[in-house]
């Protein structure tokens, strides 16, 4: 009987010879548990595991802690891969995080962090980032040092308010901080002066809600 090959991330999928964009089945580190993820095999050399995508407002991102933990949405469209998988994966080896952004005027930009990992659920999936480069602002729009993850039913931010309720979506809110890629999706011509939209402050300012976002990770030694 042929041994089942399992892949931890899209970099492993790519190196196995699968170089076409699409949905692949990945396996949790040190486990048989599986998860479906979208792999970008073309951008910047390929091998990118997509952990978040916004593009059309078809998926509700105002979700519970558990939903953000296990993931939701459709890997071929808008989705969140899942904090637990990403946490386990990024604690196995060093990963880079690339955040690709599109505005409503046809512009694109990115932020690349040379080291990214999420703490465990016990530490509220706190985000850790180092080494920012890219075109989406010289200052990190994810507050540094990193914050705990917060959702509508898991308030771990620093604000007296509940950032997830004010701004909608789960995110690494500060009080509430310069970004939220999981905010409300606003269509064109309704996307300005929105405090609760899809925000990346150091690229587009405070009230601008973006058209599309993708968060992707890849091993640093790819």
């Amino acid at each position: 009987k042929e041994e089942q090959i399992s892949f931890r991330d899209c970099a492993e999928v790519f190196k196995s010879g699968h170089t076409t964009n699409g949905i692949y089945t990945l396996t949790f580190p040190n486990s048989t548990e599986e998860i479906k993820a979208y792999c970008d095999m073309e951008a910047g050399g390929g091998g990118w595991t997509i952990i978040q995508r916004r593009e059309d407002g078809s998926v509700d991102f105002q979700r519970t802690w558990k939903e953000y933990k296990v993931g939701f949405g459709n890997p071929s469209g808008e989705y969140w891969l899942g904090n637990e998988f990403v946490s386990q994966l990024t604690n196995q080896q060093r990963y880079v995080l690339k955040i690709h952004l599109k505005d409503w005027e046809g512009n694109e930009a990115y932020s690349l962090y040379e080291h990214f990992y999420l703490s465990s659920e016990e530490l509220n999936y706190r985000i850790h980032l180092k080494g920012l480069t890219g075109t989406a602002g010289k200052i990190s729009s994810i507050s540094q040092p990193g914050n705990d993850f917060s959702t509508k039913d898991g308030d771990n931010d620093k604000c007296i308010c509940k950032c997830s309720q004010m701004l909608t979506g789960g995110w690494w809110f500060d009080a509430c901080g310069p970004s939220n890629l999981n905010g409300m999706y606003y269509p064109q011509r309704q996307n300005t002066n929105k405090f609760n939209g899809i925000k990346w402050y150091y690229w587009k300012g405070s009230g601008y809600s973006l058209k599309a976002t993708t968060m992707m990770i890849r091993p640093a030694d790819f």
């Epitope: 604000c159 007296i160 308010c161 701004l167 009080a175 509430c176 405090f195």
Partner: antibody, heavy 120, light 108 residues
């Protein structure tokens, strides 16, 4: 009509205590947050304390922590500020204010204020 | 604690003048948590602007707010006699809540 009415101010000796009340009408305090803000004679506004009556969370300025206690009785629609170990620097007009915790995320209604004088 | 540094601390202006007051926060603030208040002598403060730029109900349109991040501004486009007062910015996001030190607008 929304109204906040403070009472309980007066002259007190250093080390003494006072309890201020903030009676609300025209709205239910459990749907809002309540703040106490003070203003020393000729000075600016200083936030003192906040309570979220529905959740029971309380927050204090460092200058009053351990001496002042904010509370609320939702059945009486009233908030309180218990002030112990009073000092001369606590002399001020004390205002209670309603804080809307969605939009406007701000203190939209204020009481008329009650004067607290701490002096021997 | 977040410091809210207002400037100027006082200014003299004439009726009809355009007046600008600035407030600088010591760290990044989400815009929805910044408000401006007006206070006249012996009276309680009144809310003018919330969310950094939204005009509160009943406030004349000559008042406007702008800014984001750490720098916020209150503008009175054409000063009226009833606008002579003290103005305060405030952040409501982090405990302790903090006010600016106030800007007194006086008649020239």
């Amino acid at each position: 009509e929304v109204q906040l009415v403070e009472s309980g101010g007066g002259l007190v000796q250093p080390g003494g205590s006072l309890r201020l009340s903030c009676a609300a009408s025209g709205f239910t305090i459990s749907d809002y947050w309540i703040d106490w803000v003070r203003q020393a004679p000729g000075k600016g506004l200083e936030w003192v304390a906040k309570i979220t009556p529905a959740g029971g969370y309380t927050y204090y300025a460092d200058s009053v922590k351990g001496r002042f206690t904010i509370s609320a009785d939702t059945s009486k629609n009233t908030a309180y500020l218990q002030m112990n170990s009073l000092r001369a620097e606590d002399t001020a007009v004390y205002y209670c204010a309603r804080f809307v915790f969605f939009l406007p995320y701000a203190m939209d209604y204020w009481g008329q204020g009650t004067l607290v004088t701490v002096s021997s | 604690d977040i410091q809210m540094t207002q400037s100027p601390s006082s200014l003299s202006a004439s009726v009809g003048d355009r007046v600008t007051i600035t407030c600088r926060a010591s760290q990044f603030l989400s815009s929805f948590g910044v408000a401006w208040y007006q206070q006249k002598p012996g009276k309680a403060p009144k809310l003018l602007i919330y969310g950094a730029s939204s005009l509160y109900s009943g406030v004349p349109s000559r008042f406007s707010g702008s800014g984001s991040g750490t720098d916020f501004t209150l503008t009175i486009s054409s000063l009226q006699p009833e606008d002579f007062a003290t103005y305060y910015c405030q952040q409501g996001l982090l405990s302790p809540l903090t006010f600016g030190q106030g800007t007194k607008v006086e008649i020239k």
